[in-house]
């Protein structure tokens, strides 16, 4: 995130409810911190289509968070 500035969230707005699994290149989870007080799920889309924030309350986001946490712990 080249433009990332301290003290602000990376996403604006509630985020998309779901992204087609076939379009996902990778998922990043940003946990609450000094920079942002909420969890953020950032999806990198395939074919250089940029990034999107997934609504952390959505079913898909919950599944991704669970998957990542299982992998990491």
């Amino acid at each position: 995130f080249p433009m990332f500035k301290r003290g602000r969230c990376l996403c604006i707005g509630p985020g998309v409810k779901a992204v087609k699994v076939a379009d996902i290149e990778k998922a990043s989870i940003m946990y609450p911190s000094n920079n942002c007080d909420k969890i953020e799920v950032i999806i990198t889309l395939k074919e250089n289509k940029g990034q999107r924030c997934l609504n952390p309350k959505s079913k898909q986001a919950r599944l991704i968070i669970k998957k990542v946490e299982r992998k990491n712990f």
Epitope: C11, G13, P14, R52
Partner: nanobody, 129 residues
Framework: EVQLVESGGGLVQAGGSLRLSCAAS????????IGWFRQAPGKEREGVSI????????YYADSVKGRFTISSDNAKNTVYLQMNSLKPEDTAVYYC??????????????????????WGQGTQVTVSS
Amino acid sequence: EVQLVESGGGLVQAGGSLRLSCAASGFTFDDYAIGWFRQAPGKEREGVSIISSSDGSTYYADSVKGRFTISSDNAKNTVYLQMNSLKPEDTAVYYCAAGQGWVIATMTSFRAHREYDYWGQGTQVTVSS
């Protein structure tokens, strides 16, 4: 049917002001961030200012901070961009967009995605020196 209708563009002298309006319909306002983007001839479309109607959070490009103010009237499903101290380099077509999942870091070289974004037709802003 989703509609975003911009108004308020025009010709103004450097140092002057304009107020752009974006009237939205056909979707749930709170599910989207609403933003103003601009495209100058031969340049990429860039994010100018964005507001999330769900929590009121805002974003401003560095080039407009302190000069432009974004606000929304949720009852009217309308977003406003008050532009003060306009400069010739603000000359561009200004587009209103509604989007889901915008990542702030990507707003300077924005890639629209038809699945998640709706766009207005644009309004011309010309600032003469």
